[in-house]
């Protein structure tokens, strides 16, 4: 049943009109071709629609000759260009990603059937739902000019100005499927910028084709003010390469998009070369600016740098006579001020006001290098005091009342001797487990210790054990980091193993062998030798994402995510950088909850002496990465099953 009435009209085109109608009790779209439309065009579209069955392609339900028409499934949410123009607010990052993923899936399917689509644009992408984890969100429609392609390619100029590849627009040049990849790059650009380019194109239609043909598309983030999306921006650049051969194939585009890392990596900032960052701290989440303080430097000087994440503005100042090894932010809510405390290799504790950098002084000097700092938060609700805890290379724990950091030369309230020169106090950590809010843990030499707000040592666990056998050599190494929830996770110097200790029984209850997990990934990709892997699997940093995942950063630049509830691997982010240095969770203004990961990249410099130039790189990750890995895997699995079902049905 259908009526060619204006209220049922869904759209017009040069071929004819599309109406909303009913077919076998279902709402459908009926494409009525103009009387003068050649039968060849209808046949061409029919051939394509009849032979292709895929979750990303609009399905043909029926066809008629008098009048010439096609009955197709109806997309309840309309076209992507309508969404870009009228409902931008619905376009969350995950939805943007899923739309792109579904279109790429359809495109690679068409290309595998040797078909060039030739008219990929937001108008031809139809939406079925805006729920980001639905199996079917977006489909490609309108096969009017899709064409089978021989190996050599085709020559006719088709497509829509402003949405086509330069080789198509020029005309009279042979082109192939890579032209669609260019159009996909433009589509991705339009999704990222929520259609900003299209609005301008409507104002200046003559120039619409010119900009992208000449590769002069403005920077999406700077020009349209959209939030950075590093891996998508990179993919857009690759798809918009002038030379079709330099563009990825549609299958490669799909593989790139089929990645939770692509969705969740929200920022990638390269710091100036040879700024070697040792530590970082994020400003308090109540502050206006999403900003980070970085402790850097070489043996004879310490630099404190400030990075504004909104503007990516970077300032740096030499503040100490030796390397800054650790940083802490002390927030004093009553005074409405915050202070950055820098611990240096020479034992100096330098305190700088975050609002007024001229307000600065030092606290009483420590007896050895300051190896860790922690400002605890025992008294979020209660009237208890808060403290700045200072660990030193000679195994001492100095306790300052937080308020005293304002005072020049302030002395600690108490100093505990936990270790000695050969057993440095390398780390301090608060438990994420809500049942022990007032318990702090630390690592000193090979011992783990705990204490509460009265600063008496409650537990002292010796972690030296021959149980590791395969990794026995690392058991005697000093602990470099401890993170705590229901269990204790500890990493030791140069060890590729994270030891898991039971707090109650004080026994080792498991080992997380990074080499094994890395090997599982690399065996498939045949990447590294065993010895190399043991070296690149050295654990450098740990970070606990409450009730979700343990993030492990390695010396070889890999990040491992481990599910806390099952102790199973969620994901290895392989070769993320040359070496991961620091990982921490933060609440940063509008960025909400994020994971900050700082790593080093080493580049060989030009010239005769092959010196390695180090560049620090800060990345900001959406904290939902572990969930997104699982969601995306499920999503892809469901779509695979759907595609297989459709393929089987078409064969039958």
């Amino acid at each position: 049943e259908f009526e060619q009435a204006p209220e049922f009209l869904l759209g017009d085109g040069s071929f004819g009109s599309v109406y909303r109608a009913a077919y076998e009790g279902e709402e459908v779209a009926v494409k009525i071709f103009n009387k003068h439309t050649s039968l060849r065009l209808l046949r061409q579209e029919l051939v394509v629609l009849c032979h292709l069955h895929h979750p990303s392609l609009i399905s043909l339900l029926a066809a008629g000759i008098r009048p010439r028409m096609l009955v197709m499934e109806l997309a309840s949410k309309g076209s992507l260009d309508r969404l870009l123009q009228q409902d931008k607010a619905s376009l969350t990052r995950t939805l943007q990603h899923r739309i792109a993923l579904h279109v790429a899936d359809g495109l690679r399917y068409l290309h595998s059937a040797m078909i060039i689509y030739r008219d990929l644009k937001p108008h031809n992408v139809l939406l079925f739902t805006l729920y980001p984890n639905a199996a079917i969100i977006a489909k490609i429609a309108d096969y009017g000019i899709a064409q089978y392609c021989c190996r050599m390619g085709i020559k006719t100029s088709e497509g829509t100005p402003g949405f086509r590849a330069p080789e198509v627009a020029r005309g009279n040049v042979i082109y192939n499927q890579q032209a669609d990849v260019y159009s996909f790059g433009l589509l991705l650009y339009d999704i990222l910028t929520t259609g900003g380019r299209i609005v301008e194109g409507l104002k200046f239609p003559n120039e619409f084709d010119e900009l992208e043909i000449q590769g002069k598309l403005p920077d999406p983030v700077k020009e349209y003010g959209c939030a950075p999306w590093p891996m998508v921006e990179k993919l857009i650049k690759q798809c918009l390469k002038e030379n079709p051969q330099e563009r990825p194939t549609s299958a490669q585009v799909f593989d790139i998009l089929n990645s939770a890392e692509l969705v969740c990596l929200t920022r990638r900032i390269l710091l100036p070369k040879n700024v070697i960052v040792e530590c970082m701290v994020a400003t308090h989440h109540n502050s206006r600016n999403a900003s980070i303080w970085l402790g850097c430097g070489h043996t004879d000087r310490g630099q404190l740098s400030f990075l504004d994440l909104n503007t990516e503005g970077y300032t740096s100042e030499e503040v100490a006579d030796s390397r800054i090894l650790c940083l802490a932010l002390v927030h004093l809510p009553v005074e409405k001020e915050s202070w950055i405390v820098s611990g240096t290799q020479s034992g100096t504790l330098l305190v700088i006001n975050t609002e007024d950098g001229k307000k600065r002084h030092t606290l009483e000097k420590m007896t050895d290098s300051v190896t860790c700092l922690y400002c605890n938060s025992f008294s979020k609700q209660s009237k208890q005091k808060n403290f700045l805890l200072v660990g030193t290379a000679d195994g001492k724990l100095a306790i300052f009342e937080d308020k005293t950091v304002k005072l020049k030369g302030a002395a600690p309230l108490k100093i505990l001797n936990i270790g000695n020169v050969s057993t440095p106090l390398m780390c301090l950590s608060e438990s994420t487990n809500s049942t022990e809010r007032n318990v702090m843990w630390g690592g000193c030499g090979t011992k783990i210790f705990s204490f509460s707000n009265d600063f008496t040592i409650q537990k002292l666990i010796e972690t030296r054990t021959s149980q590791l056998f395969s990794y026995a050599a690392f058991s005697d190494s000093n602990i470099i980091t401890v993170v705590v929830d229901t269990a204790l996770y500890i990493a030791k110097q140069n060890s590729p193993v994270v030891e898991v200790w039971d707090k109650k029984t004080e026994k080792l209850c498991g080992l997380i062998d990074c080499v094994h997990f890395l090997r599982e990934v690399t065996v498939k990709e045949n990447k590294e030798s065993k010895h190399k892997m043991s070296y690149s699997g050295r654990v450098k940093t740990l970070c606990l994402q409450k009730n979700t995942a343990l993030w492990i950063g390695t010396g070889g630049g890999h990040i491992l995510l481990l599910d806390l509830s099952t102790r199973r691997l969620i994901r290895v982010i392989y070769n993320f950088c040359n070496s991961v240095r620091v990982m921490m969770t933060a609440q940063l203004g509008s960025l909400k909850n994020v994971m900050l990961v700082l790593g080093y990249n080493r580049k060989n410099t030009e010239g005769t002496q092959k010196q390695k130039e180090i560049q620090s790189c800060l990345t900001v990750w959406d904290i939902n990465l572990p969930h997104e890995v699982q969601n995306l895997e499920k999503h892809i699995e469901v779509r695979k099953e759907l595609a297989e079902k459709m393929r089987r049905t078409s064969v039958e």
């Epitope: 395969s470 209850c509 498991g510 997380i512 599982e520």
Partner: nanobody, 125 residues
Framework: QVQLVESGGGLVQAGGSLRLSCAAS????????MGWFRQAPGKEREFVAA????????YYADSVKGRFTISRDNAKNTVYLQMNSLKPEDTAVYYC??????????????????WGKGTQVTVSS
């Protein structure tokens, strides 16, 4: 369904030896860690040794290191525990266990996915 069947237990004099076997079936075990645990009367179950099915990395409790050796035969889908220089305190029910957690090696029973029914080892003085 994964099945683990232990054998080789028995009565032995202090200083003697025993070899326990654990036959595994119902799965491809390449990604598994296989372990031996023991439970003495009135005591908690404790870790003895573990081995990676692929790669063969081994792990031992301090109390058995140097006396016990864990090994596996991939062709037979079997894991062995060679126990030498046995002591009366080694008396316990020995359980074979399997865990499919890749690079996570459980040294506490709570993280093992499958268990055998156990075999009794008694060391007399």
């Amino acid at each position: 369904q994964v099945q683990l069947v232990e054998s080789g237990g028995g009565l032995v004099q202090a200083g003697g030896s025993l070899r326990l076997s654990c036959a595994a079936s119902g799965r491809t075990f390449s990604s598994y860690t296989m372990g031996w645990f023991r439970q003495a009367p009135g005591k908690e179950r404790e870790f003895v040794a573990a081995i990676r099915w692929s790669g063969g990395s081994t792990y031992y409790a301090d109390s058995v290191k140097g006396r016990f050796t864990i090994s596996r035969d991939n062709a037979k889908n079997t894991v062995y525990l060679q126990m030498n220089s046995l002591k009366p305190e080694d008396t316990a029910v020995y359980y074979c266990a399997a865990s499919d957690r890749g690079g996570f090696i459980a040294t506490s029973g709570g993280w093992m996915d499958y268990w055998g029914k156990g075999t009794q080892v008694t060391v007399s003085s």
